[in-house]
């Protein structure tokens, strides 16, 4: 028997340095979690202690707080480099800047393989990008070899800035062939290290034969055998235990996000390559595992440059910003009503008596709301939390919408409610309440609007025939998150200011903020 | 483009030893294995064995084991070839060639003629 | 270790020529044969490898086939450039194993 120890990370959204137990900027540095100091502090100590050790991360390093906003991916390679990763999978969030701004700061620069075999390249690009990601790597490890094939989320270019030439196929049709490559290069050790979702990421231990292993992320799933350590609450046990359609035993493993965790999977496997034993845990990176002094030291040095956008106060917040994905994907949140309410405020704009404003209504993704901001740091707001809140630099934009279809972006809202899926709408200017009971498609049971032709603003039916003006992020205009209809049925777009200025300007305009939960979702059964 | 330069042509006495160098560019060093491969005047291919830079992992061929040292400079992108206790039938051009990925032999070096010669 | 056996050895063909040679493995290696050409002096150049996958450049006139012991490269219509050795290799499991070569003349 061999035995292989995998060690993985998956959507750590540019937390380089520790955070606070929720994710967000860390507070109290006794209580802090995270980081990549840390992490190659236990990244060391398990490679010292075991022969056969892979650290593999499954996507998503990109996007999510000031580190990426400033450094664009440099950091993430300089990093992943110390750390010593030996492969890593493409996640949709590397595209955010564009392929351009996957290439030159990311794939030029590791000193790693980076793969998926999903994504296909044509056209020009084809030449640019050849070799510098690959379908699958054969990775030595003591005295056997171990094939790692990647996948990233074909929702890609629905969710990110991939552009027209790459092809994202199907996960599954994709894998099959490179995995009988592999084999045919009597390689009988597999990985699947991938993007696309613990869902897909079951059907890929199921579906594609020869696949002993899948690492995963894009869900953010929390695994764990036993009593889980903080505050997340596990998905299932760790590994998850996938029988593949050939009768197989496959574990499936993530490790939640934001490098809270270190995966820690080991598999024994026979001489045939076969998985006889799989086994661990995440392991929750806490105080009690001390920074890697150089890393740290390299941090801070690199910190340096993000000083400038850390230490201007915004504006105070005397309450909790809750924007959780807890919350936001599943109900009104407060961090979302702040959002909104800055994003109609940034519109104010009285050119005719009949009209108190031209604008009264926000919607605005759940899914693109990445971190909440705790009122105990004095309550101050700097660019730097909102960078982690809003990190994609993404525009607040005008368009002009039929009432039917901001009907059906409520529906596609809801239509498969309860999974964590990003597409669930915040609002400002509408009430909207949904019935659970009904069916996908059918669960929008009222639906009021605030008015703009009027003098004191109130909330009217939606008219399904009347033109309305509505703010959301260029993501929603673009047919982001599954809003086609949006995309397909808008009459007028016009594009707007940066997200996080946005909201800057509306905090500091206020100075002091205290939004609250106040009914604009609701929740019902029965009938209206 | 991709390019890997090997070090100069070599004559040695017997029981003495030979370090080729293979200085690669054009690509991220770490992330390719670099093969050795042995050809004797006149005669075919043999396969040496393997270094994988990323993680400095050595695989040899058991044929070559006990005289042949593989190693590689990451910060100089460079893999080194050491063969020991040279005899007479070790005489003959060494190369380095890199993966496409994996297993098959992409690129070379120009070779190194190593003479070994009384 | 995987024995591969080159056929011919040797062989005399004109420019225009159609040319097969044949590696025999000494078990199934699937289709994970690759070719290579080589020419006096000079570092092999890897044509074909996944048995039939063209490596970069190659021209179209370089096909291979076969699968498990028995694998063929064949020139479709021979340029003088074409006159060099030729290797085949198994990149199935190590040791990595080549043929002995065969060395294409001209006639």
């Known amino acids: 028997a061999w035995e292989l120890t995998i060690l993985h990370t998956n959507d750590v959204h540019s937390r380089l340095e520790q955070t606070s137990e929720d994710s967000s900027k860390c507070v109290n540095a006794s209580r802090c979690m995270g980081g990549v100091a840390r992490l190659f502090t236990k990244v060391q100590q398990i490679r010292r202690a075991e022969p056969n050790v892979l650290l593999l991360d499954a996507g998503d390093q990109y996007q999510g707080t000031i580190w990426f906003t400033v450094y664009k991916g440099a950091e993430v390679a300089h990093f992943m480099n110390a750390l010593r990763y030996d492969a890593m999978a493409l996640g949709n969030h590397e595209f955010d800047n564009g392929v351009e701004g996957l290439i030159e700061p990311l794939l030029k620069e590791a000193k790693f393989p980076i793969l998926s075999a999903n994504i296909k390249a044509k056209g020009p690009l084809a030449s640019q990008i050849s070799g510098l990601y690959l379908p699958y790597k054969v990775l030595p490890v003591g005295d056997e070899v171990v094939g790692i094939v990647g996948y990233t989320s074909k929702e890609t270019p629905f969710l990110s800035n991939p552009g027209t030439n790459l092809v994202f196929e199907d996960e599954i049709t994709a894998l099959q062939p490179e995995v009988d490559k592999l084999k045919t290069l009597n390689v009988n050790k597999i990985i699947a290290l991938g993007h696309s979702g613990f869902e897909m990421d079951k059907l890929i231990a199921q579906k594609v034969r020869g696949v002993d292993v899948v690492v995963g992320g894009h869900s953010n799933t929390f695994l764990y055998t036993g009593n889980p350590p903080s505050k997340e609450v596990p998905a299932g046990k760790y590994p998850f235990i996938v029988t593949s359609d050939d009768g197989r035993k496959v574990p499936v493993v993530q490790a939640y996000a934001f490098g809270k965790y270190l995966g820690y999977l080991k598999i024994e496997f026979d001489e045939r390559g076969n998985v006889i034993s799989s086994h661990g845990n995440p392991i929750l990176l806490n105080s009690s595992i001390p920074e890697d002094p150089s890393i740290k030291a390299d941090i801070n040095k690199w910190r340096i440059k993000l000083d400038n956008y850390s230490t201007q106060e915004l504006g105070k917040t005397i309450v909790y910003l809750d924007g959780s994905s807890q919350s936001c994907r599943f109900r009104e949140c407060n961090m979302g009503n702040l959002i909104c309410d800055a994003m109609i405020n940034n519109n104010l704009r009285h050119t005719d008596e009949m009209f108190w404003n031209h604008v009264s209504m926000c919607i605005l993704n759940g899914g693109g709301i990445r971190s909440p901001i705790d009122e105990r740091n004095n309550g101050t707001i700097t660019w730097e939390n909102l960078a982690a809140v809003l990190p994609f630099g993404g525009t607040f934009d005008l368009v002009q919408l039929k009432g039917s279809t901001l009907k059906k972006a409520f529906e596609h809202s809801v239509h498969r409610y309860g999974q964590s899926t990003g597409e669930f709408l915040q609002v400002g200017g509408i009430h909207v309440v949904y019935d659970l009971s009904r069916k996908p498609g059918d669960r929008v049971v009222k639906l009021d609007v605030l008015c703009t032709k009027c003098r004191v603003p109130s909330y009217d039916p939606l008219k399904m025939d009347e033109v309305y003006k509505v703010i959301l992020p260029n993501f929603l205009a673009n047919g982001g998150d599954g809003f086609q209809m949006i995309k397909d049925e808008l009459l007028r777009h016009d594009s707007g200011d940066q997200d996080i200025n946005v909201v800057s300007t509306y905090i500091s305009k206020m100075k002091v903020i205290y939004p609250a939960v106040e009914g604009r979702i609701k929740f019902s059964t029965g009938s209206h | 483009q991709v390019q890997l330069v090997q070090s100069g042509a070599e004559v040695k006495k017997p029981g003495a030893s030979v370090k080729v160098s293979c200085k690669a560019s054009?690509?991220?060093?770490?992330?390719?294995?670099i093969y050795w491969v042995k050809q004797r005047p006149g005669q075919g291919l043999e396969w040496i064995g393997w270094?994988?830079?990323?993680?400095?992992?050595?695989k040899y061929n058991e044929k070559f084991k006990g005289r042949v040292t593989i190693t590689a400079d990451k910060s100089a992108s460079t893999a080194y070839m050491e063969l020991s206790s040279l005899r007479s039938e070790d005489t003959a051009v060494y190369y380095c060639?890199?993966?496409?990925?994996?297993?098959?032999?992409?690129?070379w070096g120009q070779g190194t003629l190593v003479t070994v010669s009384s | 270790d995987i024995q591969m056996t080159q056929s011919p050895s040797s062989l005399s063909a004109s420019v225009g020529d159609r040319v097969t040679i044949t590696c025999k493995a000494s078990?199934?290696?699937?289709?994970?044969v690759a070719w290579y050409q080589q020419k006096p002096g000079k570092a092999p150049k890897l044509l074909i490898y996944w048995t039939n996958t063209r490596h970069t450049g190659v021209p179209s006139r370089f096909s291979g086939s076969g699968s498990g012991t028995d694998h063929t490269l064949t020139i479709s219509s021979l340029q003088p450039e074409d006159f060099a050795t030729y290797y085949c290799q198994q990149h199935y499991s190590t040791p990595f194993t080549f043929g002995q070569g065969t060395k294409l003349e001209i006639k």
């Open positions: 060639a890199r993966d496409d990925n994996y297993a098959w032999f992409a690129y």
């Open positions: 054009g690509y991220t060093f770490t992330n390719y294995y």
């Open positions: 078990q199934d290696v699937s289709t994970a």
């Open positions: 270094i994988y830079p990323g993680n400095l992992n050595i």
